[in-house]
């Protein structure tokens, strides 16, 4: 376990071999989750890229947060996708939080502390627990089958995950840098493995 506070993973160039694998202590399927993270890239007006990829053996797109060029954020649960459009692209560090719950199917998507309109996806579904969680690449099969054209070039950090939906107040607290206690992925006590050309550097966002 490593305390990654105020650090970020840096992916300096496009590749299909560089990634970070995160280890999560999940023992039972997820009926809800929240993922929050920071990232910083110049790619957004050039091509799509993977932000957070959670695959199971049953479903390679179990949870996927992806930037789709000319559209915005693509969010997938259990292979089913919804989009959150971004009309204008700026190059700056971005903080996102996204949550989903099985009971209602409701998805929340927050960008820099501001909520997008709620949408619905995969009501009644459960997310598999035995997962391969990858930063820097999009998994087309469990733990692999990467394409360089979908890789992240830039920085990613403050990756935290909960097995429940955070309240708006809690998400605001996280965005503002207040205290929180993630129970699936914890950036302050991170179990991870680096493959390829990935560097750990001080974070560039506040």
């Amino acid at each position: 376990q490593t305390d990654m506070s105020r650090k970020a993973f840096v992916f300096p160039k496009e590749s299909d071999t560089s990634y970070v694998s995160l280890k999560a202590p999940l023992t039972k399927p997820l009926k809800a989750f929240t993922v929050c993270l920071h990232f910083y890239t110049e790619l957004s007006s050039t091509r799509g890229y993977s932000i957070f990829s959670y695959a199971t053996k049953r479903q390679d797109n179990e949870i996927l947060i992806f930037w789709s060029k000319d559209i915005g954020y693509s969010f997938t649960v259990g292979g089913s996708e919804i989009l959150f459009e971004v009309p204008e692209v700026t190059v700056a560090p971005v903080h996102i939080c996204t949550s989903w719950e099985s009971a209602s199917g409701i998805v929340e998507f927050w960008v820099d502390g501001k909520p997008r309109v709620r949408k619905s996806l995969k009501k009644g579904y459960t997310v598999g627990a035995e997962a391969s969680i990858i930063l820097g690449q999009e998994q087309d099969s469990f733990g692999g089958n990467f394409e360089g054209s979908q890789s992240l070039v830039g920085d990613i950090g403050n990756v935290n995950m909960w097995d429940f939906v955070l309240s708006p107040d809690e998400i605001n607290t996280i965005y503002l840098g207040g205290p929180f206690s993630p129970n699936v992925l914890n950036w302050r006590a991170l179990k991870y493995e680096v493959q390829g050309e990935v560097f750990t550097k001080p974070q560039l966002w506040p």
């Epitope: 992806f66 693509s74 997938t76 292979g79 089913s80 619905s120 009501k123 999009e138």
Partner: nanobody, 117 residues
Framework: EVQLQQSGPELVKPGASVRMSCKAS????????IHWVKQSHGESLEWIGF????????YYYKNFRGKATLTLNKSSSTAYMDLRSLTSEDSGVYYC??????????WGQGTILTVSS
């Protein structure tokens, strides 16, 4: 075996509308979005939009807003695309595909649309 079976070729006059279909089999229809894609002669693929069979939600790419309408019939596992106010520019091969904007794993065989007077 997953299959997407599309309807046959269409020859229509300018100004008319057309409906094409995409019948899915071999998987649970509501588990995956159905995308529609256009290929004009010698051109690259153009993404039209997609529909979520689970809840009926649709998304249209900018160039096809007002041109295409996506619907479905859950009981027959069939997705439909209506195209309106057709011109010769709309001629091409239209494909349905299963998946996401990131990856599409199964494709229909295509429906040829010819718009001509």
């Amino acid at each position: 075996e997953v299959q997407l079976q599309q309807s046959g070729p269409e020859l229509v006059k300018p100004g008319a509308s057309v409906r094409m279909s995409c019948k899915a089999s071999g998987y649970t229809f509501t588990d995956y979005n159905i995308h529609w894609v256009k290929q004009s002669h010698g051109e690259s693929l153009e993404w039209i939009g997609f529909i979520n069979p689970d809840n009926g939600d649709t998304y249209y790419y900018k160039n096809f807003r007002g041109k295409a309408t996506l619907t479905l019939n859950k009981s027959s596992s069939t997705a439909y695309m209506d195209l309106r106010s057709l011109t010769s520019e709309d001629s091409g091969v239209y494909y349905c595909a299963r998946g996401t904007t990131v990856e599409k794993d199964y494709w229909g065989q295509g429906t040829i649309l010819t718009v001509s007077s």
